[in-house]
Amino acid sequence: IVNGSDCQKDAQPWQGALLLGPNKLYCGAVLISPQWLLTAAHCRKPVFRIRLGHHSMSPVYESGQQMFQGIKSIPHPGYSHPGHSNDLMLIKMNRKIRDSHSVKPVEIACDCATEGTRCMVSGWGTTSSSHNNFPKVLQCLNITVLSEERCKNSYPGQIDKTMFCAGDEEGRDSCQGDSGGPVVCNGKLQGLVSWGDFPCAQRNRPGVYTNLCEFVKWIKDTMNSN
C-alpha cells in the first residue's frame, strides 16, 4: 500500500497473508468463512502457508495469530495467467479458525459498488514500487470507487465487468504484495486487489480490483460442493 497508514490492530480481522517458506509474504487474502479464504487467482502456488490475526509484517509471534495450510486451491475457471479477468481463487484451509477479536470472516457484498463509494484496502505490500520497501505493520488506505467510464479510459481495452477501478488520487494505491487482499466498502467485501499500472500510484492509473459482486453465486456454489 502506497501512502496508506498503519491499520488499527484487529480492525481488519479478515485480512490474511499468503507466505512462501517460513515468512515470505507474496499475496494477501481474505477470510470469508470459518474455513475458506478468497484471494487473487494469480496468487496460486503449489505450496504456501496462511497467516491470520497478525498485525506486524515481521514473523514475531503475536497472541492473536493463527497459522494454516491450504488443502484446496480453486481458481475461477475463467482465469488464465497472466491475464486479469476473473482474478479470484478460493482456498480451503486445513481446519476452521478459532473465532476471536483478531480473526473473523467478512461478508461478501451482493450488490456491485457504485461510483463514489468509499472503501478501505489493506495489505502488507510494498510502500513504493521500489520493491524492497515494506511496511512494519498492516497498512490501510481509503479509496474511492471510480466510474466504469473513467476506469476504461485509464486502461483502454483491458477492463471488463469482472473488474472495477478505485483510488486514482496520485500517490495513493495498492502495490506489489497486496494482491488478493480485501477492498471493504460499507462493512462488506467488495473486491480483491488484482492489478494496476507499474509503478504503482500514478496519476490517472488507478488500482484495479476483482469485482466480487459478479461472483457471489460461484463462490457459494464452490464452497458448498467442496
Epitope: 487473487a40 492489478w195 499500472d197 488500482g207
Partner: antibody, heavy 126, light 107 residues
Framework: EVQLVESGGGLVQPGGSLRLSCAAS????????MNWVRQAPGKGLEWVSY????????DYADSVKGRFTISRDNAKNSLYLQMNSLRAEDTAVYYC???????????????????WGQGTTVTVSS | DIQMTQSPSSVSASVGDRVTITCRAS??????LAWYQQKPGKAPKLLIY???SLQSGVPSRFSGSGSGTDFTLTISSLQPEDFATYYC?????????FGGGTKVEIK
Amino acid sequence: EVQLVESGGGLVQPGGSLRLSCAASGFTFNDYSMNWVRQAPGKGLEWVSYISSSSSYIDYADSVKGRFTISRDNAKNSLYLQMNSLRAEDTAVYYCARDLTSMQSRDYYYYGMDVWGQGTTVTVSS
Amino acid sequence: DIQMTQSPSSVSASVGDRVTITCRASQGISSWLAWYQQKPGKAPKLLIYAASSLQSGVPSRFSGSGSGTDFTLTISSLQPEDFATYYCQQVPIFPYTFGGGTKVEIK
C-alpha cells in the same frame, strides 16, 4: 507452438542505426512483458531493455539509455528495438525474451524469462 | 545496480558427478533469482525461478536453493546434455542483472 523470431540485425557503421523486430506467436502477446537481452561475442548475457504489456513501463540498461528505444505493437504481436548512435561495443547477438512476471499484477513474486528467440546478430564496424 | 557474482567461472566434471554453482548478489533480493542454461549457438533456457522452483519440463536433477544474497544451483548427477554455460539473474529490481556465467566442461 510458442515462438519468438528476431530479425533486422546486420552490419552497420559506428554512429549508424538499426531497428530490430521480434515476431511473437503461439501465445497472447499483449498479456506479457518483454525484454531485449544481448550477448557480445564470447561474453555473458547482458539485459538491455524491458517493456510492460501495455507499454506503460519501460526501462533500459545504463549502457544504452538515450540511444536505444524499445516499443511494441500488440495488434501486430511484435516487439521492436530502435538502435541509434551505435558503437563497436554494441556488437552482439540480440535476443528478445518473454517475461513471466506481470508487473501489472500486484503479487510480490518474480519469475524470469521463459521464452527466448533464436537471436539476431548486430555487428558495428567500420 | 545489483551486481551478481558467479563462481566458479568454469568447472570440469564427468558424467554422473554432482556439480554446484554459486551466485552472490551485492544486496538482498529475497528469493527472486532465476537460473538459465545456454548451449553454444543457442538461446538461453530458463531452468529455475524464484531461487528453487523448477521450470516446467526441466529434469529434476536440477535444483536451486538460497535466499537473500547467496544462491546455489546443483546438478545432482551430470548428464551429457548438461555440458553448457549457466547464468543466474536477479529479477526483482531494474536494471535486471546477470551473473558472469559458469561453464560446465567435460573433464
